[in-house]
Interface confidence: medium
C-alpha cells in the first residue's frame, strides 16, 4: 500500500481542502473510526487500484486517525493497513469530543491505561490534573493518543491554553473493578453414587463481583430441569457458589456435569466439568498384580501393599495362616488402609524388623454389603548368608581338608578359591577357583539341609586338598540373593611346624 502524501502525520489548515490518495495491488478503501469515508475508487490499466479521499472545508473535528486498507481484508497483515494522523489546528475546538464510554475507564488489574484527551494542534502544551487539584501530574503526553500511565481510582482533567484562554477537558473517571480472570472449580460430594443416593455438586468462583452460572447435566438434555442454588460464601474476595442437588439418583444421571461461568465486565468465561457415575450396586476391585510369592529380609522392615477400588468404603482385614491380624502393641506389625482418592484405597501391612516366624500365608480381605475381594500370597523370609565355621584338618589319609559351614535363605551358593603366593594375592594374582571335578588336586563335597524351624538352609562344604606343598590361602565365600560373606584360612603343608 502506498499513501500520498505519506505522512505519518500531517498538519492541515482549517477551512482548507486536501486530497489523499492510496494505491495498492487490490481494491483499497479509506476508513476513519472503523467507517468507510466517501471516496473515489479507480483501477488503472496496469492493474493497480487506487482510492482518492478529498477532505473539504476542514475543521478541528477532522483531527484524528485515517486508515487505508485493502477492501475486505481488514488488515490481516501489518502491511495491508496504513495509518495516517491528521491535525487541523482550530482555535474554536478545545479538546476533541469523547464518546461517553471513553470518559469512564474501568480497570480490572494494575495496568497502564490512556486518558484520551486530544487537541487539534500538536504545538499546544497539555497538562493532566486531578479534578480537584491544580498541580500538573508528571505523566507523558502523546498528542495523537493522550496521557498514558498507571492511574489510581480518581477523576482527572486535561488542561491547555489556546491563545490567551485556558481550556479544560471533560472529566475522566478511573474505576478499579473487582474482576479477576474467571477461575472456576467444580467438586462433588461424591463422584460415584449408588442409585437412590444423592448427587450434590458445587461450582465456586473467587474474586468476581458479578457472575452468571449455567449448568449442563444429563437430566437437562432430557428436559428434566433442576434449579441450582447460588450463595455468597464470604464478602471478600467474592466467593460465589452455585449448588446443584439431584436427590435419588438414577443410572441415567451418570455422565458429565459442566458448570459454565461468565462475567460481563470483560466478557470472560470459564467452565469446568466433572464426571459422575451412578452404579447399580457397590463394588470392590483389585488394581494391579501382587505376586503369589513375596520376600522379606530378616531383621529389615517390609511393607506389603495392596491397591484396590471400592464404593462404598469397605472394611479391610488381614490374616496370617487364617488368623486375623491386628496392630500389635509391641509395634511389630502395623496395619493401615489409606483412601488415596475418592474410590481408591491402599492397604498396607508393615512387618517391623521381620522375624523368621513371620513367614507364612497372608490374605487381605476387603468387603462391604455389596461385594468383597481377597488377595493371598506366601511370604518368604530371606536371611543374608553368613559363614559360621571355616576349619582345617589333617585326616590320616595324608590329604588335608577344609570345612566351611554357613546358613542363609534362599539357599546359599558356595565358592572356594585359593591363592598360592600369599604376598601377591589377591591383587596381582586372581584367586583360583577350587573344586572343579576336572582338577585332581582338590575334591569337593557339599551337603545342603533345610531347617524347618529356622526356615533357612545350611550348607556344609568340605574341600579335600591332595598335595599341599607350600602355604595356601583358602577362602570360602557364601552368597545368596540378599548377601555375601566369606572367611579365609591358611593351609600349610604337613611338613611345616606352624600354621
Amino acid at each position: 500500500l502506498v499513501i500520498t502524501p505519506p505522512g505519518p502525520e500531517l498538519i492541515l489548515n482549517v477551512s482548507s481542502t486536501f486530497v489523499l490518495t492510496c494505491s495498492g495491488s487490490a481494491p483499497v478503501v479509506w476508513e476513519r473510526m472503523s467507517q468507510e469515508l466517501p471516496q473515489e475508487m479507480a483501477k488503472a490499466q496496469d492493474n493497480t487500484f487506487s482510492s482518492v479521499l478529498t477532505l473539504t472545508n476542514l475543521t478541528g473535528l477532522d483531527t484524528g486517525e485515517y486508515f487505508c486498507t485493502y477492501n475486505d481484508s481488514r488488515g490481516l497483515e501489518p502491511d495491508e493497513r496504513k495509518r495516517l494522523y491528521i491535525f487541523v489546528p482550530d482555535p474554536t475546538v478545545g479538546f476533541l469530543p469523547n464518546d461517553a464510554e471513553e470518559l469512564f475507564i474501568f480497570l480490572t488489574e494494575i495496568t497502564e491505561i490512556t486518558i484520551p484527551c486530544r487537541v487539534t494542534d500538536p504545538q499546544l502544551v497539555v497538562t493532566l490534573h486531578e479534578k480537584k487539584g491544580d498541580i500538573a501530574l508528571p505523566v507523558p503526553y502523546d498528542h495523537q493518543r493522550g496521557f498514558s500511565g498507571i492511574f489510581e481510582d480518581r477523576s482527572y482533567i486535561c488542561k491547555t491554553t489556546i491563545g490567551d484562554r485556558e481550556v479544560d477537558s471533560d472529566a475522566y473517571y478511573v474505576y478499579r473493578l473487582q474482576v479477576s480472570s474467571i477461575n472456576v472449580s467444580v467438586n462433588a460430594v461424591q463422584t460415584v453414587v449408588r442409585q437412590g443416593e444423592n448427587i450434590t455438586l458445587m461450582c465456586i468462583v473467587i474474586g468476581n463481583e458479578v457472575v452468571n452460572f449455567e449448568w449442563m447435566y444429563p437430566r437437562k438434555e432430557s428436559g428434566r430441569l433442576v434449579e441450582p442454588v447460588t450463595d455468597f460464601l464470604l464478602d471478600m474476595p467474592y466467593h460465589i457458589r452455585s449448588i446443584l442437588h439431584i436427590p435419588s439418583a438414577e443410572l441415567e444421571d451418570s455422565g458429565t456435569y459442566t458448570c459454565n461461568v461468565t462475567e460481563s465486565v470483560n466478557d470472560h468465561q470459564d467452565e469446568k466439568a466433572i464426571n459422575i457415575t451412578v452404579v447399580e450396586s457397590g463394588y470392590v476391585r483389585l488394581l494391579g498384580e501382587v505376586g503369589a510369592l513375596q520376600f522379606a529380609e530378616l531383621h529389615r522392615s517390609r511393607t506389603l501393599q495392596v491397591v484396590f477400588e471400592a464404593y462404598p468404603p469397605p472394611t479391610v482385614l488381614w490374616f496370617k495362616d487364617n488368623r486375623t491380624l491386628g496392630d500389635s502393641s509391641a509395634g511389630e506389625i502395623a496395619l493401615s488402609t489409606r483412601n488415596v482418592s475418592e474410590t481408591r484405597y491402599v492397604s498396607e501391612l508393615t512387618l517391623v524388623r521381620v522375624k523368621v516366624a513371620e513367614a507364612g500365608h497372608y490374605t487381605m480381605r476387603a468387603f462391604h454389603e455389596d461385594a468383597e475381594v481377597q488377595l493371598s500370597f506366601q511370604l518368604q523370609i530371606n536371611v543374608p548368608v553368613r559363614v559360621l565355621e571355616l576349619s582345617e584338618s589333617h585326616p590320616d589319609s595324608g590329604e588335608q581338608t577344609v570345612r566351611c559351614r554357613g546358613r542363609g535363605m534362599p539357599q546359599p551358593n558356595i565358592i572356594w578359591s585359593a591363592c598360592r603366593d600369599l604376598k601377591r594375592c589377591p591383587r596381582e594374582l586372581p584367586p583360583m577357583l577350587l573344586g572343579n571335578s576336572s582338577e585332581e588336586e582338590s575334591q569337593l563335597e557339599t551337603n545342603v539341609t533345610y531347617w524347618e524351624e529356622e526356615q533357612e538352609f545350611e550348607v556344609v562344604s568340605t574341600l579335600r586338598l591332595q598335595h599341599v606343598d607350600r602355604p595356601l590361602s583358602v577362602r570360602c565365600t557364601l552368597r545368596n540373593a540378599v548377601g555375601q560373606d566369606m572367611q579365609e584360612v591358611i593351609v600349610v603343608p604337613h611338613s611345616l611346624p606352624f600354621k
Partner: antibody
Framework: EVQLVESGGGVVQPGRSLRLSCAAS????????MHWVRQAPGKGLEWVTV????????YYADSVKGRFTISRDNSKNRLYLQMNSLRAEDTAVYYC???????????WGQGTMVTVSS | DIQMTQSPSTLSASVGDRLTITCRAS??????LAWYQQKPGKAPTLLIY???SLESGVPSRFSGSGSGTDFTLTISSLQPDDFATYYC????????FGQGTKLEIK
C-alpha cells in the same frame, strides 16, 4: 591402559529416570565384578550396587533398592545403571569401580554428575 | 549392616609429620579392609587392601595394620601430595565406607 569411563549424567527432575553407562577397556571385563559408588556434593563415598562377573548376582544398597537396576553387557565391555523414580537425595557424582569377589575396588572411573532438581 | 567409623574427621599436619588415621568396624571383619585416597574433583584411588597389603605403585610411606574391628592407616613422613581425604572400606559382608578423614595443611 586399564580404564573405566562413565557417561549419561545430567540434570533430571524428581520422579524421572536416567541411565548411566560405564565403558571398560584394558582388561578382561567379563572376569570381574563391577560396582557403582556415589558421592553427594561435599559428602563421603556411598556404595550403591554390585553385579557379579557373569551377571548372576546383583546387590543393592537399601537407599536405592527397587528404584535402581544394575546390568552389564560383556560383549560390549559395558556396565549400566538404570535409575528410576529419582529423588533430590540421589544427586551425586556416580563412579563405576572394578572389584573382584572379596576384593577392594582397584580401578575407578572419573565419575559422572547426576543432579535431581525441579 | 556393618558400620565403619573413622577418626578423626579432620586432621591438620605438616610436611614430614608421621600420622595415623583409625577406622573401627561395628563387628569383626577379619582383615577385609581397604584404604582409599581422594583428591578434590577426582576419583578415589586404592592405597591398601586386605588391611595391610600395599597396592602396587603406592609409595611405601603408606602402611596399614589391624584385624577384627580396629584398623589404622599410617603415613610415615607426610609429603605435599598426601593432603587429601582418606576413606576406609570393609568388603567382608556387602560394602561400606567410613565417613572420611580430611587431611589438611597445618
Amino acid at each position: 591402559e586399564v580404564q573405566l569411563v562413565e557417561s549419561g549424567g545430567g540434570v533430571v527432575q524428581p520422579g524421572r529416570s536416567l541411565r548411566l553407562s560405564c565403558a571398560a577397556s584394558g582388561f578382561t571385563f567379563s572376569n570381574y565384578g563391577m560396582h557403582w559408588v556415589r558421592q553427594a556434593p561435599g559428602k563421603g563415598l556411598e556404595w550403591v550396587t554390585v553385579i557379579w562377573y557373569d551377571g548372576s548376582y546383583k546387590y543393592y544398597a537399601d537407599s536405592v533398592k527397587g528404584r535402581f537396576t544394575i546390568s552389564r553387557d560383556n560383549s560390549k565391555n559395558r556396565l549400566y545403571l538404570q535409575m528410576n523414580s529419582l529423588r533430590a537425595e540421589d544427586t551425586a557424582v556416580y563412579y563405576c569401580a572394578r572389584g573382584e569377589l572379596g576384593d577392594a575396588f582397584d580401578i575407578w572411573g572419573q565419575g559422572t554428575m547426576v543432579t535431581v532438581s525441579s | 549392616d556393618i558400620q565403619m567409623t573413622q577418626s578423626p574427621s579432620t586432621l591438620s599436619a605438616s610436611v614430614g609429620d608421621r600420622l595415623t588415621i583409625t577406622c573401627r568396624a561395628s563387628q569383626s571383619i577379619s582383615t577385609w579392609l581397604a584404604w582409599y585416597q581422594q583428591k578434590p574433583g577426582k576419583a578415589p584411588t586404592l592405597l591398601i587392601y586386605k588391611a595391610s597389603s600395599l597396592e602396587s605403585g603406592v609409595p611405601s610411606r603408606f602402611s596399614g595394620s589391624g584385624s577384627g574391628t580396629d584398623f589404622t592407616l599410617t603415613i610415615s613422613s607426610l609429603q605435599p601430595d598426601d593432603f587429601a581425604t582418606y576413606y576406609c572400606q570393609q568388603y567382608k559382608t556387602s560394602w561400606t565406607f567410613g565417613q572420611g578423614t580430611k587431611l589438611e595443611i597445618k
